[in-house]
């Protein structure tokens, strides 16, 4: 049954919203998809979760959620926000998750985000953001996950990322980024997942991934790369790499020499004609290798040290004979 305290909590539930105790004597409040044009006024001070997504909220006043010191998650996705003023999140000392996706923001709300020291997850995807100010994330020392996909970025906001040393996952997919400069992510030593797919990336700085010492997943699919991304060679912990649907014509010798932990490589839908014979050596974790239409391959790839392949597909090549060692190299 419900305790007397939960009854008191539920009396602080805004009209038409759905409320329930969160099991810690705090309140989860769901006011989503109610056609609201402004924030509810009679929120309980004990609210820990507030979902205001899929409404018609077009503006936030400064300090619109006073006294919600226990609020940990605020969802404002799918509204009509074009601007968030300074002070919009004042007093939200416990805020860990902030969802602002699917709005009409043109800039990262720098001033509003300042001092959200507990924030761990920030969703800014599906807005119209074209500019990320250099200091916009400077106070977000706990941030672990950042979504900036599906915006209008044309370049990597290099300086803005410098303060995010705790960041573990980030997506910059579905933007208009055309180049990644050297040390673009130089301070993101905790980053494990980086999504850059569906951009217009045609060139990578030789050292563009330097500093990403924890990176395990890199997604460069659906870009305009003409050359193999040799910058991956410093990613010693990389497990999953995607660069399918680009314009890469060759995979060089020793292509993955710095990536011995690779389990998965997706590179289909590239006009690959040449593959260096040593390209896939020393990849003990690799399970699947598919090379379709590489017409300039005349020798079977040297798979020394790549002993756990479960599936190998080679089509359209010019290989006339198999080496005697091929059955020794494969399981």
């Amino acid at each position: 049954g419900s305790s007397p305290r939960s009854g008191v909590l539920l009396r602080g539930c805004p009209t038409h919203c759905h409320c329930e105790p969160d099991g810690r004597m705090l309140l989860r409040v769901d006011c989503s998809d109610l056609g609201l044009s402004e924030l509810p006024s009679n929120l309980s001070v004990f609210t820990s979760y507030l979902d205001l997504s899929m409404n018609n909220i077009s503006q936030l006043l400064p300090n619109p959620l006073p006294s919600l010191r226990f609020l940990e998650e605020l969802r404002l996705a799918g509204n009509a926000l074009t601007y968030i003023p300074k002070g919009a999140f004042t007093g939200l000392y416990s805020l860990k998750v902030l969802m602002l996706q699917n709005n009409q923001l043109r800039h990262v709300p720098t001033e509003a985000l300042q001092n959200l020291r507990s924030l761990q997850s920030l969703r800014l995807d599906a807005n119209h953001i074209s500019y990320v100010p250099p200091s916009c994330f400077s106070g977000l020392h706990s941030l672990r996950h950042l979504w900036l996909d599906d915006n209008a970025l044309t370049e990597i906001p290099v300086q803005a990322f410098r303060s995010l040393s705790a960041l573990q996952a980030m997506t910059l997919a579905l933007n208009k980024i055309h180049h990644i400069p050297d040390y673009a992510f130089g301070n993101l030593s905790s980053l494990v997942v980086l999504h850059l797919h569906n951009n217009r990336i045609h060139s990578l700085g030789k050292k563009c991934f330097d500093g990403l010492h924890s990176l395990e997943t890199l997604d460069l699919n659906y870009n305009n790369l003409d050359e193999f991304p040799t910058a991956i060679r410093t990613l010693s912990n990389l497990k999953e790499l995607g660069f399918h649907s680009n314009n890469i014509r060759s995979i060089p010798e020793k292509a993955f020499v710095g990536n011995p932990s690779l389990i998965t490589i997706h590179f289909y839908d590239n006009p690959i004609q040449f593959v260096g014979r040593s390209a896939f050596q020393h990849l003990p974790e690799l399970r699947t290798l598919t090379l379709n239409g590489a017409s300039q391959i005349t020798e079977f790839p040297d798979l020394t040290g790549t002993a756990n392949l479960e599936s190998l597909t080679l089509t359209g090549a010019q290989i006339s004979s198999l080496p005697q060692t091929v059955c020794n190299q494969l399981p």
Epitope: V158, G186, K207, R233, G258
Partner: antibody
Framework: QVQLQQSGTELMKPGASVKISCKAT????????IEWIKQRPGHGLEWIGE????????DYNEKFKVKATFSSDTSSNTVYIQLNSLTYEDSAVYYC???????????WGQGTTLKVSS | NIVLTQSPASLAVSLGQRATISCRAS??????????MHWYQQKPGQPPKLLIY???NLESGVPARFSGSGSRTDFTLTIDPVEADDAATYYC?????????FGSGTKVEIK
């Protein structure tokens, strides 16, 4: 902890070649560039070039392209610089250093002194 | 090549006072908001030691009396207050563009 240990002093004759080694410990060898720097009294510090260990990725200062060749051995975590056709001007202290945060040189070897003398 | 001009060539500073060293680049070393300028300290018979990276970021383990500032072409290393152990030669270095280049050095003596 990170350490770069270089080979000892070399005394060579003009026209000869020398190979200086730099053994790295305490970090993932293939994840950082190794830079080579020359220091001569009165000439300050000169960047010779860099190599990403284990790969064929190298970059040379145009001035040293003919003089220097870099190589690496991942089995022993060692990088090498070979200097050929030695002249008196090659007499110097040669340092290896790790390219760290944003390419700054965060760890240095102790230096290898090369003396070219007939 | 980018030329780095350091001044002064030498500097005598009293204990507890401030030492200021300048480094001017022949062209900007800024890229995407980062200044690719670094500072090193070298004592006789030792390799250089990194003090400051990206113009103003203190390397781990370096005392807070060292600070760096500047952008584009003009950079400054400041030691305040100077201690006896700071007697050394200080170099700036850019890695904005190949070939990476160093300044000619500033020798700091303690009075």
């Amino acid at each position: 902890q990170v350490q770069l240990q270089q080979s000892g002093t070399e005394l060579m004759k003009p026209g000869a070649s020398v190979k200086i080694s730099c053994k790295a410990t305490g970090y993932t060898f293939s994840a950082y560039w190794i830079e080579w720097i020359k220091q001569r009294p009165g000439h300050g510090l000169e960047w010779i070039g860099e190599i990403l260990p284990g790969s064929d990725s190298t970059d040379y200062n145009e001035k040293f392209k003919v003089k220097a060749t870099f190589s690496s051995d991942t089995s022993s975590n060692t990088v090498y610089i070979q200097l050929n056709s030695l002249t008196y001007e090659d007499s110097a202290v040669y340092y290896c250093a790790r390219g760290g945060h944003y390419g700054s040189l965060d760890y240095w070897g102790q230096g290898t002194t090369l003396k070219v003398s007939s | 090549n980018i030329v780095l001009t350091q001044s002064p060539a030498s500097l005598a500073v009293s204990l507890g006072q401030r030492a200021t060293i300048s480094c001017r680049a022949s062209e900007s070393v800024d890229n995407y908001g980062n200044s690719f300028m670094h500072w090193y300290q070298q004592k006789p018979g030792q390799p250089p030691k990194l003090l400051i990276y990206l113009a103003s970021n203190l390397e781990s383990g370096v005392p807070a009396r060292f600070s760096g500032s500047g952008s584009r072409t003009d950079f400054t290393l400041t030691i305040d207050p100077v201690e006896a152990d700071d007697a050394a030669t200080y170099y700036c270095q850019q890695n904005y563009e190949d070939p990476f280049t160093f300044g000619s050095g500033t020798k700091v003596e303690i009075k």
